[in-house]
Each structure stands twice: as structure tokens, then as C-alpha cells.
Amino acid sequence: SGVFQLQLQEFINERGVLASGRPCEPGCRTFFRVCLKHFQAVVSPGPCTFGTVSTPVLGTNSFAVRDDSSGGGRNPLQLPFNFTWPGTFSLIIEAWHAPGDDLRPEALPPDALISKIAIQGSLAVGQNWLLDEQTSTLTRLRYSYRVICSDNYYGDNCSRLCKKRNDHFGHYVCQPDGNLSCLPGWTGEYCQQPICLSGCHEQNGYCSKPAECLCRPGWQGRLCNECIPHNGCRHGTCSTPWQCTCDEGWGGLFCDQDLNYCTHHSPCKNGATCSNSGQRSYTCTCRPGYTGVDCELELSECDSNPCRNGGSCKDQEDGYHCLCPPGYYGLHCEHSTLSCADSPCFNGGSCRERNQGANYACECPPNFTGSNCEKKVDRCTSNPCANGGQCLNRGPSRMCRCRPGFTGTYCELHVSDCARNPCAHGGTCHDLENGLMCTCPAGFSGRRCEVRTSIDACASSPCFNRATCYTDLSTDTFVCNCPYGFVGSRCEFPVGLPPSFPW
């Protein structure tokens, strides 16, 4: 689609005569008829296939034609066409004398023709005017012409339709050849695809408008390149969404179980050596002179009762000293000068001669020990209490005071926190050394699965055409609220598409 434009510039008819040679009375009141048609090797009469146009009376005899494009648009003359410009044409320009005001062909005498010119040739679409001058024996016509494309038409033949737009169907202007030129921030064949923020992760991010970076579920950060760890992950990281890969020294589903209590809490005192023995469990190996679960108690060197055979122990700065009873000697009063005749066995112990009476041995009754049955048995010396339990002597017996979470005679049994079914809504209970943990079914969360959480059905962006997605909490399904002009359960069907829609 385009326009053939003809600009009449000057017409010379000095003698004021008609084509027949007869003079006009009083002068030649001149108007023009223009016929534009397809290329003919010899321009002949017939239909003006590309169009016709007539002017009003422009002057008398000889005159210049004023450029009137700004005023009424009469000069240049406009011959619009609604087809692909073929590149060739034939043009007939007739100058006529108007005796009266009626310029219709049937109202004019046949000899009112002043002059007629016919040209044909090639003409490319362009802004430049071609100047031409045609001279006959009596007249001269100077004019120029060109072919330009109509608004929104482009290309060598004005055949390429392109209308700039900035809406859902595209964001572009048109180049001189009719190709699209995307507006800043848009790309794609029809400039419908926004260019996301520079660096926005190709898979994990997307955008609905330029320079935006929206993250897909499970990703975060300005460029959507940081994964979101599992909700509740304490001492862990992720490399893909919803992971919880534990830092060194931590365990459990949420990496909140302390596997390295020694490093994280340094529980052993007085230079003791700490050994991890499970989640939140440890053992302290005390240096000489210290005792207690955490080696927090300082031992007197006499506390280990080093003096035998009833010897009494005295603490000294550089150690200890044993004061031996009569009949004994040695560093720990371990050597005897007694025999059974001296009744050396205390607390009802029985004496047995050895080495032909040179020595003896005492057989002690229950609850007593020592070479002379002089010591009460300390039932705690063998550390019988497990899991850090504290041993207490109670007369002839002993008992273990257990740490929280343990029970049994020797604190050997875990207290089962799961026995009372603490996990709600079908959650699975796991016994841990420092408590319990619930694994919740889909749709529930919280420490005891007591919180109902909706499965976000909208997370997968199921709706088309920028429809708004809502999650139906009662059914955990999505509902798409369609914008005007779209239907379907996911708003996937446009009701109508304009003819210029870029499919």
C-alpha cells in the first residue's frame, strides 16, 4: 500500500491556445486530469488501473503551481494504491480549458483539450522526487513525481506491513525495510520476550518485564543463583533446593544434632581429653589428680587410698606418705612382719598361713577388702554407670544417678520420648539422644506436625496469559483468574486474535 505523488510546478501556454490551435476566450482557464496505470510499452487509452485524480482550475494560460501540501493537500496530487508497487508505471497528464465551473468530462466540449502528455517507465519507491519537463509545439509542463509507502508499510514494494506496538503482543518499532526493531529490554522474533536482569540465572530465574529477575521455587538471591535450604536447616547448606547438607560436626535431618560436642562446647575441665561418643554425648579422660564426669573435681592423692593394711595417708606437697600400723612397713605398708598368731585380719576375716608361717593371707567377708580386710568395698570403683551416670555408694549396695534421657539400674536404657505418640497428623517419631524428632506428612509442619500448611498448587505457575493464580486451601488445587479476553481453566485460550497478531 502506498501513494504515487505528482507535483505540478509550472505550465506554459504563452499564446493561450487549445490543442486544436483555436484560442481560448478570454484565456485558457487550465485544470489537469491525471491517469496512472500499469506499464504499457505504448501508452494507450483504457482504464486507469492505478487511479485517477483531477485538479480544480489552477491558472490561466501560463502559471506556476503553488505547493499546497500544507494547506489543502491538492499539490502534490495523491494517487493512493492498495497493492504491491510493481516498480513500473504509465502516466497520462491532460491539461484542459474550463469555459465554465462544471469540470466533469461530460460537461466539457471535446475540443477543450489544451495538451496531453504520456510517459512510462520504472520507478522505485523512495523519498526523492524525479523532475521532468514535457514540451509540445505550443505548451510546456514542468512537474516532479515519486512513490512513497503509506503509513505502516515498508520495503521496496510497500508490501511489508509493520505497525509499531508496545503491548502484550510485542514491543517494537519498524525499520525502513519493515523489519522489527525491538524496544530496549525486549527480544525475540516479535519482541515479546523480556531481557531479564543481566546475570539472572537461565534456569532458576525468569522475568515478565525487562531488567527483572524473579526466582523459581527453591531459589533466591538477586540473580536467583542461591538455593534455598530445607526449612529449619540449622547447621547445613544446599547445592540444590530444599537440601540440608550438614556442616562438619552436625547431623540429623535439620543438621541440628551435635555430633562434635567436644569441639562445640569444650565440656572437659582441667586439661582432660574429650572424646565424642554420639549425639550430644562425650567422655572425659581425666588427668591424674582429677575426677568427675567433666574432670571438674580435684582429687587429693590420698583419695585413692594408697596405704594398705590399715596404714593412714598423709597429704604432702610433693605427694603423700603412709603411716603404717604395727607389723607393717613399706611405701604403701604392703610388707608384713605379722603372722596369723597376731590376728591380723579385721572385720571377721579368716587368716591362712603361707610359706611355713612366714606370711599369711586374709579371706574377707562380703563388703570388705584389703590385705587385712580393713577396707569397705567401694562398689563405684569399676565405673558401672553408663551414659555419664553418677555412681553413689549406699551402704552395702550402690546406685546410679542417671543423666536426663536415660534410665535403668546402670543408666543403660534410653527414655523413649516417642512412647507417648507426640507426633500429630500421622507424623513419624524418631528417638534421638537429646530428645525426639517428628517427620511430617505432606501438608503439615511444626515440631510436632501440628501446623497445617497448604501445598502451594500455584508454585508451578500453571496459569497462562498473565492470569492470577489462587490456591484453594480446602482442596490444595489452583484456580486461575483470567484477564479480559481469555478463557479456559488455565486461561490458555484467547477469545479472539487481531488479524495483525504475529502468529
Partner: nanobody, 119 residues
Framework: EVQLVESGGGLVQAGGSLRLSCAAS????????MGWYRQAPGKQRELVVG???????HYADSAKGRFTISRDDAKNTVYLQMNSLKTEDTAVYYC?????????????WGQGTQVTVSS
């Protein structure tokens, strides 16, 4: 690549019937919506009927009571049964499949099949 091929168009007298078929290839379409559009000369392309992935159907007012959409997922084919045809049903009928991949929307169209209803 996804391809849609329509068939079944032709010349029919007013009041007659036609059955259009759209065969899809290049993917499995059981989870996709499918639809039929038509375009008369000089007019905009308009929805005739669509069937969503959940099986719900959406008819234009002009198609209600006369046209029926159905699908055969085993054959990857959608059908349009057109009864009581009128001269104003004359148009090129296009098959349409909207697809959403990784948040981006794509529209696949067939080449169209001409339906002409004569009086």
C-alpha cells in the same frame, strides 16, 4: 518439533455436517489443552471451542449446541464435530495447542483447513 495437521474441511451445504481432525506430533499431548479457532476473510481469528488439560470445555456462543469437541489422547488427535452448519461458519479453521515450559508460553498452530458452507 511440534506439528499440527488439520483435515476434514471442504464444501458443504447449509444444514450439513463436517468433522475436522487435528493430528499432533512431536510430543505427547495428553496433558495439554487443545482448541479450534477460525478466521473468515478480513476478520479476526476467533475461538470456536477449547478443551483444557483437565477436560473442561469452553464454547463460543456461536458454537454452542451445534459443535462438539473431543480428543483421543492415544492417537494425539482432537476432533471438531460441526452440525447444522450455516453460511456464516465459512472460514479457515485452525488447530491450536498452548504449551507452558519453564514459565514461558508457546502457541502452536496448524496450517488451517478451509470450510465453505454454501446456501
Amino acid at each position: 518439533e511440534v506439528q499440527l495437521v488439520e483435515s476434514g474441511g471442504g464444501l458443504v451445504q447449509a444444514g450439513g455436517s463436517l468433522r475436522l481432525s487435528c493430528a499432533a506430533s512431536g510430543s505427547t499431548f495428553s496433558n495439554y489443552a487443545m482448541g479450534w479457532y477460525r478466521q473468515a476473510p478480513g476478520k479476526q481469528r476467533e475461538l470456536v471451542v477449547g478443551i483444557s488439560s483437565d477436560g473442561s470445555t469452553h464454547y463460543a456462543d456461536s458454537a454452542k449446541g451445534r459443535f462438539t469437541i473431543s480428543r483421543d489422547d492415544a492417537k494425539n488427535t482432537v476432533y471438531l464435530q460441526m452440525n447444522s452448519l450455516k453460511t456464516e461458519d465459512t472460514a479457515v479453521y485452525y488447530c491450536y495447542v498452548p504449551v507452558k515450559v519453564a514459565g514461558l508460553e508457546y502457541a502452536y498452530w496448524g496450517q488451517g483447513t478451509q470450510v465453505t458452507v454454501s446456501s
